[in-house]
């Protein structure tokens, strides 16, 4: 339904405080240098326009769009230019055209420093004394390093973190109680920017097609009882509310993903068996938990897949009448029976059987064309299983930071052109997957696995995008999203790259490695390996777990020594001599 | 027992528009996704449109994005199809049709409509 003031009516419904904080997250998120005073500023004068618009939707302005409202405040900031460059340019435009200017110089890997969280007293004393903004400033802070995180979805990671400070902050120890809980809150929020990212990516590379296949085959198989009709409904409206966060419409997504929250509790017994502890939750809460939600049981009596995609002589009629629905149908019934596939892989199944009906409904005899399709299913199921085998059974031997070491090693022969911070985080989020996934019962293994290895080298594509430099990692981005992984993990040691000569500065290392914690020592180390991969990039592993041994060996050393400068001054060359002569 | 009874069909001008209505009754209407299916004069059937009980539109022919509008009115156990920017190809016989889990399983009588200059 239309309404006289758009602002108004989102104010109502979010009412003021998510109003306040998806307001703070979409500035942030389209002016990421801007400090948070300048933006609450700009927060606190959208909320009393918005609040005179409640009063009276006909005064002046309120009729204007939120995009028209939001893309003023922003071309009204002095020194725009100075500071965002040619992002100005995007103020002489007109609504629709400044929103979607704004949203192309979004800024993936936005130069600020990493976000250092506070010791622990110093962090309970600014919440204690101002829990609104301090809770306003984790907002802004997240929002403006990750441009695509989705809004609704950072309004509850917010909540959580005022949960965990005001639990921990009356503790005698709070350190203790803060440090587990916030890296936890943490590791789930990277988690789903990453993921979140990948959606956007999606929707702006492929369209909403493509989207809502993927939202058809996660569903089905989250709701394997629903019908039809009741997954496309579902994956219909799931689309609409991504695409409008991704389109930086924050306010319409996060009212349209309660009210998704709403009618899917209105209607649990049409969707799952499962809903009903999240349906008792307050709305941030109900819409993650539904979002998270366990898959309900399959049905007993499923039919095998054949009979309706195989065996039933309709089959090419039945596509070309209308092949949207028929594809849709494929992908729902195949999906509901697998929740232990990923949907990366579903979706590939999906587009072997269309690509299959386009060839055997052209022929003379098509059931005896596509007769056999499911059994040509099976190297492609076998791939990713092979896969989380392997990579599982690796990470199993070495633990985290040596899984890390074996993918960075691999990462860096396949893409030496790639920069050493690239393929660093790249390598430490890829190895995560073994800590994330491995541990999980057999079933939940590979969709864990390789939708996170998606999600991961979907950010891999969006850095190598903004500067390109590896034409192997170009050609597997610019494929289908679902196709990456296997493009990625293809991909062999790179033989047109020209080695990087020895630097003996990129292995000379000072004191201050000693006082570094412990992540931050690692990707030292990690740094250095890279660095050692691209000079050697045909180094055997037994050669560069020498030199790696040799390096950590001369570090714990030298930081336990008296006088540690001089240690690494005179250890420092002779570790580089030797791991020159190791590699040679 | 099920019923729907199909109008709003006739002769229009290309580029006209028409608003097709299906009356429902003998079933709970709000609980079902309903569709419009159409056959061209010595052609197959092709669907047209499906719409989910709650009115978010699931499907719509390739043929007729953009210019056609699935909508339900459940309080009046109503179907619509609002038809803009008609085209010659466009002449078919238009069923209304109730879906159930996985397929139409009632039809209507069909409306005709004609788009011809």
């Known amino acids: 339904e239309a309404h006289k003031s758009e602002i108004a009516h989102r104010f109502k419904d979010l009412g003021e405080q998510h109003f306040k904080g998806l307001v703070l997250i979409a500035f942030s998120q389209y002016l990421q240098k801007c400090p948070y005073e300048e933006h609450i500023k700009l927060v606190q004068e959208v909320t009393d326009f918005a609040k005179t618009c409640v009063a009276d939707e006909n005064a002046e302005n309120c009729d204007k769009s939120i995009h028209t409202l939001f893309g003023d405040k922003l071309c009204a900031i002095p020194k725009l230019r100075d500071n965002y460059g040619e992002l100005a340019d995007c103020c002489a435009k007109q609504e629709p055209e400044r929103n979607e200017c704004f949203l192309q110089h979004k800024d993936d890997n936005p130069n600020l420093p990493p976000f250092q969280r506070p010791e622990a007293e110093a962090m309970c004393t600014s919440f204690q004394e101002n829990p609104t903004s301090f809770l306003g400033h984790y907002l802004h802070e997240v929002a403006r390093r990750h441009p695509y995180f989705y809004a609704p979805e950072l309004l509850y990671y917010a909540e959580k973190y005022n949960e965990v400070l005001t639990q921990c902050c009356t503790e005698s120890d709070k350190a203790a109680c803060l440090t587990p809980k916030l890296d936890a809150v943490k590791e789930k929020a990277l988690v789903a920017a990453v993921r979140q990212r990948m959606k956007c990516s999606s929707m702006q590379r492929f369209g909403e097609r493509a989207f809502k296949a993927w939202a058809v085959a996660r569903m089905s198989q989250r709701f394997p009882n629903a019908e039809f009709a009741e997954i496309t409904k579902l994956a219909t409206d799931v689309t609409k509310i991504n695409k409008e966060c991704c389109h930086g419409d924050l306010l319409e997504c996060a009212d349209d993903r309660a009210e998704l929250a709403k009618y899917m509790c209105e209607n649990q017994a049409t969707i799952s068996s499962k809903l009903q502890a999240c349906c008792d939750k307050p709305v941030l809460q109900k819409s993650q938990c539904l979002a998270e939600i366990e898959h309900d049981n399959i049905p007993a009596d499923l039919p095998s897949i054949a009979a309706d995609f195989v065996e039933d002589k309709e089959v090419c009629k039945n596509y070309a009448e209308a092949k949207d629905v028929f594809l849709g149908t494929f992908l729902y019934e195949y999906s509901r029976r697998h929740p232990d596939y990923s949907v990366s892989l579903l979706l590939r199944l999906a587009k072997k059987y269309e690509a299959t009906l386009e060839k055997c409904c052209a022929e003379g005899d098509p059931p005896a064309c596509y007769g056999t399709v499911l059994a040509e299913f099976q190297p492609l199921v076998e791939e990713p299983k092979n896969l989380v085998k392997t990579n599982c059974e690796l990470y199993e031997k070495l633990g985290e930071y040596g899984f890390q070491n074996a993918v960075l090693v691999r990462y860096t022969q396949k893409a030496p052109q790639v920069s050493t911070p690239t393929l660093v985080e790249a390598a430490r989020n890829l190895g995560r997957v073994g800590t994330k996934c491995c541990t999980l019962p057999e079933a939940q293994r590979l969709p864990c696995v390789e939708d996170y290895l998606s999600a991961i080298l979907n950010r891999l594509c969006v850095l190598h995008e903004k500067t390109p430099v590896s034409e192997k990692v170009t050609k597997c981005c610019s494929g289908s999203l679902v196709e990456r992984r296997p493009c990625f993990s293809a991909l062999t040691v790179d033989e047109t790259y020209v080695p990087k000569e020895f630097k003996a500065e990129t292995f000379t290392f000072h004191s201050d490695i000693c006082t570094l914690p412990d992540k931050e020592k690692q990707i030292k180390k990690q740094t250095a390996l890279a660095e050692l991969v691209k000079h050697k990039p045909k180094a055997t592993e037994d050669q560069l777990k020498t030199v790696m041994g040799d390096f950590a060996q001369f570090v714990d050393k030298c930081c336990k020594a008296a006088d540690k400068d001089n240690c690494f001054a005179t250890e420092g060359p002779n570790l580089v001599a030797r791991s020159k002569e190791a590699l040679a | 027992e099920v019923q729907l009874l199909e109008s709003g069909g006739g002769l229009v001008q290309p580029g006209g528009s028409l608003r097709l209505s299906c009356a429902a009754s003998?079933?709970?209407?709000?609980?079902?996704?309903m569709g419009w299916v159409r056959q061209a004069p010595g052609k197959g059937l092709e669907w047209v449109s499906l719409?989910?009980?709650?009115?978010?539109?699931?499907y719509y022919a390739d043929s007729v994005k953009g210019r056609f509008t699935i909508s339900r009115d459940n309080s009046k156990n109503t179907l619509y199809l609002q038809m803009n920017s008609l085209r010659a190809e466009d002449t078919a016989v238009y069923y209304c049709?109730?879906?159930?889990?996985?397929?139409?399983?009632?039809w209507g009588q069909g409306t005709l409509v004609t788009v011809s200059s």
């Open positions: 049709a109730k879906w159930s889990s996985r397929a139409f399983d009632y």
């Open positions: 003998g079933f709970t209407f709000n609980h079902y996704t």
């Open positions: 719409i989910h009980p709650s009115g978010t539109v699931i």
